[in-house]
Interface confidence: low
């Protein structure tokens, strides 16, 4: 006859790991006991149960409530047993020894793996902002037995970078992704996507990206020159920029206070009839948390009795 | 336009296994996940799994024994199955699309499913 | 699994009022928040995503702000279409949803 077992058996940290072990013997065999031991390298035998043919399963105290035959029908010739909840600790070599009648001793050997699935996280980095080098937008870190896969999923253009530690029965591993940041990467999301023989699918952590910045202003109203003349209705100024987070408006005249009757609404400057005293200079300030922009345009009312032209400058400044 | 439209029985016996299929137009599956929500009567919403737009699937842990989610992307079809129901699944179930994260943008008309003998 | 704490669970208002309805993590969620809008027989509809970002078509009464563990979503002035349930979701890992905030007419 022979035994029957696996060479290496793996489950996943808390599992139930069954031990296999069966006697493949001629007819009218029988098997009068099956013991099971641990067996690492350089220790002594620790033993775990002994499977009795007429008196049962006696389990060793270290294992007292850990070992179980597998539930019934049960063959006489299969001497498995199970090892419930399994931990990092049981990972090593086991050794059935099975006596048989009248074939005599017969024994093998498997390796037990515990895979311990990892739990990773992610951490965002730094605050991005426009303008900024290459900057760290986040890292991930998975530690599991086997060391797990940690890579990125994301439409974003960046750098990968991963290190390793190891520790006695697991490996801890981080990756970092690095971006150019630009307001173009503003709502995109960044997964961290962890691989592990332990799990049933990738896990995947995803970190929504955030970016400040804060655009040129510019001014609009002044396009059509002739229209700034003196009686107008409904003339008015619009400043024009864009940023995250989104920027606030306020509006200055250069050369003196508003004039009265001028109307500030957040973004745009609104006139009551046009006279001449509402020529001047006029200045949008924009700005956020991480920038502020001016732009200054020259407003000149016309008086349709003078012939003289209007003048319009535009200057930005930043 | 992007639409997601649900089908499948609007009664399922305790024990059985519920089956419902979403059926996509406007997108294609391999570029949005397709997620299922449900949201018993006068509560609120639950998640309850995805298949990503790669094929992978993820559950929400204490209904993953029970879920099983798969798609025909020949026929832009996505198929949700819940097995040994109970009572306490009785729902309005919803599909919906995402990219590849967890927030929805377009969501099925919703199916009203009774568990009840 | 992270938990969503959404208060009111109910408020009253009237047309024109400023409506703030807030959602509180049990972790730190980094701003992966999502605020949905749900009527009497429908579907939720997407308002705003990543804590801050308006969605397509939504009115810009509406603003979502917050970080960390804290999110409020703003109605500027409260319009006749805008009496219905709303929800907050977390996207930070297995997906949860607040308990929903009931906006009525007072």
């Known amino acids: 006859g022979e035994l029957e077992t696996s060479d290496v058996v793996t489950v996943v940290l808390g599992q139930d790991a069954k031990l296999p072990c069966f006697y493949r013997g001629d007819s009218g065999e029988q098997v009068g006991q099956v013991a099971w031991a641990r067996v690492d390298a350089g220790e002594g035998a620790q033993e775990l149960a002994l499977l009795h043919s007429k008196y049962g399963l006696h389990v060793s105290p270290a294992y007292e409530g850990r070992v179980e035959q597998p539930p019934p029908p049960r063959n006489p010739l299969d001497g498995s047993v199970l090892l419930r909840n399994a931990v990092q600790a049981d990972e090593g070599e086991y050794e059935c020894r099975v006596s048989t009648f009248p074939a005599g001793s017969f024994q093998a050997r498997l390796r037990l793996r515990v895979l311990v699935p990892p739990l990773p996280s992610l951490n965002p980095g730094p605050a991005l902002e426009e303008g900024q080098g290459l900057t760290l937008a986040a890292s991930c870190t998975a530690e599991g037995s086997p060391a797990p896969s940690v890579t990125w999923d994301t439409e974003v253009k960046g750098t990968t970078s991963s290190r390793s530690f190891k520790h006695s029965r697991s490996a801890a591993v981080t990756s970092e992704f690095h971006l150019v940041p630009s307001r173009s990467m503003n709502g995109q999301p960044l997964t961290c996507v962890v691989s592990h023989p332990g799990l049933l699918q990738d896990q995947r952590i995803t970190h929504i990206l955030h970016v400040s910045f804060l655009a040129e202003a510019s001014v609009r109203g002044l396009e059509d020159q002739n229209l700034w003349h003196i009686g107008r209705e409904g003339a008015m100024l619009k400043c024009l920029s864009e940023g995250q987070p989104p920027p606030s408006y306020n509006w200055t005249r250069l050369d003196g206070p508003l004039p009265s009757g001028v109307r500030v609404d957040g973004d745009t400057l609104g006139f009551p009839p046009l006279t001449t005293e509402h020529s001047g200079i006029y200045v949008c300030h924009v700005s956020n948390e991480f920038s502020s922009r001016d732009s200054q345009v020259t407003v000149d009312v016309l008086d349709p009795q003078e012939d003289s032209g209007k003048q319009v400058d535009l200057v930005s400044a930043s | 336009q992007v639409q997601l439209q649900q089908s499948g029985p609007g009664l399922v016996k305790p024990s059985e296994t519920l089956s419902l299929t979403c059926t996509v137009s406007?997108?294609?599956?391999?570029?949005?996940?397709v997620h299922w929500v449900r949201q018993p009567p006068g509560k609120g919403l639950e998640w309850l799994g995805v298949?990503?737009?790669?094929?992978?699937?993820d559950y929400n842990p204490s209904l993953k024994s029970r879920l099983t989610i798969s798609r025909d992307t020949s026929k832009n079809q996505v198929s949700f199955k819940m097995s040994s129901v109970t009572a306490a699944d009785t729902a309005v179930y919803y599909c919906?699309?995402?990219?590849?994260?967890?927030?929805?943008?377009?969501w099925g008309q919703g199916t009203l499913v009774t568990v009840s003998s | 699994d992270i938990q969503m704490t959404q208060s009111p669970s109910s408020l009253s208002a009237s047309v024109g009022d400023r409506v703030t309805i807030t959602c509180r993590a049990s972790e730190n969620i980094y701003s992966n928040l999502a605020w949905y809008q749900q009527k009497p027989g429908k579907a939720p509809k997407l308002l705003v995503y990543?804590?801050?970002n308006l969605a397509d078509g939504v009115p810009s009464r509406f603003s979502g702000s917050g970080s960390g563990t804290d999110y409020t979503l703003t109605i500027s002035s409260l319009q006749p279409e805008d009496f219905a349930t709303y929800y907050c979701q977390h996207f930070w890992g297995t997906p949860t949803f607040g308990g929903g905030t009931k906006v009525e007419i007072k």
């Open positions: 298949i990503w737009s790669g094929g992978s699937t």
């Open positions: 406007g997108f294609s599956l391999t570029n949005y996940g």
């Open positions: 990543a804590a801050t």
């Open positions: 919906a699309r995402s990219g590849k994260w967890y927030y929805f943008d377009y």
